[in-house]
Interface confidence: low
């Protein structure tokens, strides 16, 4: 439905507060290096303009597209060329090429300082002094560091952030109240960002069809009582929402997400019995709740899939009439029966089924040809089951930190060209699968583990895409979205890798390590482990374990010493010499 003024339409739909927040997020995600004050100024100018359009939709420029309005505004930034280099060239383009150009320059790993959390009293004072600026700064800092963060969900995080400060800054023990809440928001925020990044990668790198297939599988698992037509409608709407958010159309995205939540709640009876509580919540909480809602119970007495998809003589006729609809129905029927499978496994099964029909429907006897198609699924199902079983056993045996270390060694040997910070970040996240998923019963392990691994491996893919260094990573990332994990699992030691020259500086540590948090200390040790493997890729587990144990003892000893710095210098030399000898460096 066309509106005379798109900006007025969105302002009225969303309200001033959400409009301003979403424009700030959009601008911060595009111009990630710009100072906070500059963005606030731009947002205020856009907001004032939007108000004039609300008052009179026929006013000058009110008929322009949001991309045109926002792009023009971004291109007024004086320091664009100095700060962003070639991104400034985007401003010479016309829409829609200009917006595409801005999107291409989004940086998944911007060169920004780590966010350091001030003292609780300092934060509470800032919150009380100017609540609005304090919350805007939160949106700005998250958005610029996570340029694909799901904008309407970031509004929900900001609401929780505000609630935490409102409650805790009045508490007797502010820190005890606030810090766990901020930790939880930080961890949930990182997870939310990574999940959304996979959705955007899926749409941008593999297309709408790939995203829709993912959505059919996931929504069919979540809403197994819903009819196929209902799931299809939800998939279409959800695809629109995520396409918009991933494309920088945040106002449309937030508006459409609200409409989708409204539709779902108005049609609960034909969707899921688990939505009641979600639908009683305010908008932001409601949308979040729906996105996280548990799977509904499977309908009783679902018939065998074989009847419609193998035994029927009409399989090829039905497939030929509407290929994607038929495959969609197959995926829907399979997924609703298998909440115990990962989405990526379900997509592999659907792909195998599609490949079989493509081949068999052209054969002399199609039915004879595809009769055993379900037998081909067994090894596909068993592969992730076995992998998860083995890795959960290893996790239970080692604990999270040592399990992460095993993965660090494994992945450094597979792709040693990847930067050390990326290998550490990705392997640490891969290792978290243990704590996250291994506690679950068998029926929930695979969807938890393999779909989480897809999210983490996508982080590797987007970080690697910025500075490609490994053909093997590129291959695994680009060939097939659903086979990324099997592809990385199948990679073995890279025999072509020339070991890195030994540099003693890499293994020189100082007293500052003693004041680090346990997490930061682990990262230091894991960074050393990756470097060690890069220097000696053929080092055995036993050799690496010995060196890592020595390193832990070294840190512990020197952090207890009176003259820490001298200890690190002297003991460090000794440790490096011993490690070199042990590893034959």
């Amino acid at each position: 439905d066309a509106h005379k003024s798109e900006v007025a339409h969105r302002f009225k739909d969303l309200g001033e507060e959400n409009f301003k927040a979403l424009v700030l997020i959009a601008f911060a995600q595009y111009l990630q290096q710009c100072p906070f004050e500059d963005h606030v100024k731009l947002v205020n100018e856009v907001t004032e303009f939007a108000k004039t359009c609300v008052a009179d939709e026929s006013a000058e420029n009110c008929d322009k597209s949001l991309h045109t309005l926002f792009g023009d505004k971004l291109c007024t930034v004086a320091t664009l060329r100095e700060t962003y280099g070639e991104m400034a060239d985007c401003c010479a383009k016309q829409e829609p090429e200009r917006n595409e150009c801005f999107l291409q320059h989004k940086d998944d790993n911007p060169n920004l300082p780590r966010l350091v959390r001030p003292e609780v009293d300092v934060m509470c004072t800032a919150f009380h002094d100017n609540e609005e600026t304090f919350l805007k700064k939160y949106l700005y800092e998250i958005a610029r560091r996570h340029p694909y963060f799901y904008a309407p969900e970031l509004l929900f995080f900001a609401k929780r952030y505000k609630a935490a400060f409102t409650e805790c800054c009045q508490a007797a023990d502010k820190a005890a109240c606030l810090l766990p809440k901020l930790d939880e928001l930080r961890d949930e925020g990182k997870a939310s960002s990574a999940k959304q990044r996979l959705k955007c990668a899926s749409l941008q790198k593999f297309g709408e069809r790939a995203f829709k297939a993912w959505a059919v599988a996931r929504l069919s698992q979540r809403f197994p009582k819903a009819e196929f037509a209902e799931v299809s409608k939800l998939v279409t709407d959800l695809t629109k929402v995520h396409t918009e958010c991933c494309h920088g159309d945040l106002l449309e995205c937030a508006d459409d997400r609200a409409d989708l939540a409204k539709y779902i709640c108005e049609n609960q009876d034909s969707i899921s019995s688990k939505l009641k509580e979600c639908c009683e919540k305010p908008l932001l909480e409601k949308s979040h709740c729906i996105a996280e809602v548990e799977n509904d119970e499977m309908p009783a007495d679902l018939p065998s899939l074989a009847a419609d998809f193998v035994e029927s003589k009409d399989v090829c006729k039905n497939y030929a009439e509407a290929k994607d609809v038929f495959l969609g129905m197959f995926l829907y029927e399979y997924a609703r029966r298998h909440p115990d499978y990962s989405v990526v496994l379900l997509l592999r099964l659907a792909k195998t089924y599609e490949t079989t029909l493509e081949k068999c429907c052209a054969a002399a006897d199609p039915h004879e040809c595809y009769a055993k198609v379900f037998d081909e699924f067994k090894p596909l199902v068993e592969e992730p089951q076995n992998l998860i079983k083995q890795n959960c056993e290893l996790f239970e045996q080692l604990g999270e930190y040592k399990f992460q270390n095993a993965l660090l060694v494994r992945y450094t040997k597979k792709v040693p060209q990847v930067s050390t910070p990326t290998l550490v970040e990705v392997s640490r996240n891969l290792g978290k699968v243990g704590s996250k998923c291994c506690k679950h019963p068998e029926a929930k392990r695979m969807p938890c583990a393999e779909d989480y691994l897809s999210v983490v491996l996508n982080q590797l893919c987007v970080l690697h895409e910025k500075t490609p260094v490994s053909d093997r990573v590129t291959k695994c990332c680009t060939e097939s979205l659903v086979n990324r994990r099997p592809c990385f699992s199948a990679l073995e030691v890279d025999e072509t890798y020339v070991p890195k020259e030994f540099n003693a500086e890499t293994f020189t540590f100082h007293a500052d390590i003693c004041t680090l948090s346990e997490k930061e200390r682990q990262i230091k040790k894991q960074t050393a482990l990756v470097e060690l493997v890069k220097h000696k890729p053929k080092a055995t587990k036993e050799q690496l374990k010995a060196v890592m144990d020595d390193f832990a003892a070294f840190v512990e000893k020197c952090c207890k010493a009176d003259d820490k710095e001298t200890c690190f210098a002297e003991e460090g030399k000794k440790l490096v010499a011993a490690s070199q000898a042990a590893l034959g460096l």
């Epitope: 081909e376 090894p379 596909l380």
Partner: nanobody, 123 residues
Amino acid sequence: EVQLVESGGGLVQAGGSLRLSCAASGLSFSKYAMGWFRQAPGKQREYVAVISSSDTTYYTNSAKGRFTISRDNAENTVYLQMNSLKPEDTAVYFCAADSYVTALQTLTQISYWGQGTQVTVSS
């Protein structure tokens, strides 16, 4: 055009040996994992052995200790040395190539297949 051509099959007595060869052309052979599979009459095709691009070898339980897979990257050929053959080893043996070991192990969308060579083990 990629081609995988198997040879070396035939009739052999139980307890005997055979060496199968698979000559590859049209692909960067050394970069591929190679596998041997078999299909007995009326049964599903099953994986027997795989050798990765870095020469790591994998076998099914029935092949372990009796069969040896190897490759010669200079000759673009993969071999399957089969010793202590049994009548239940009778099947058509296929060679296949794929970028991924797991794809070969699980018969998942394998990139390239040969036409097969018949192995018959008489008692």
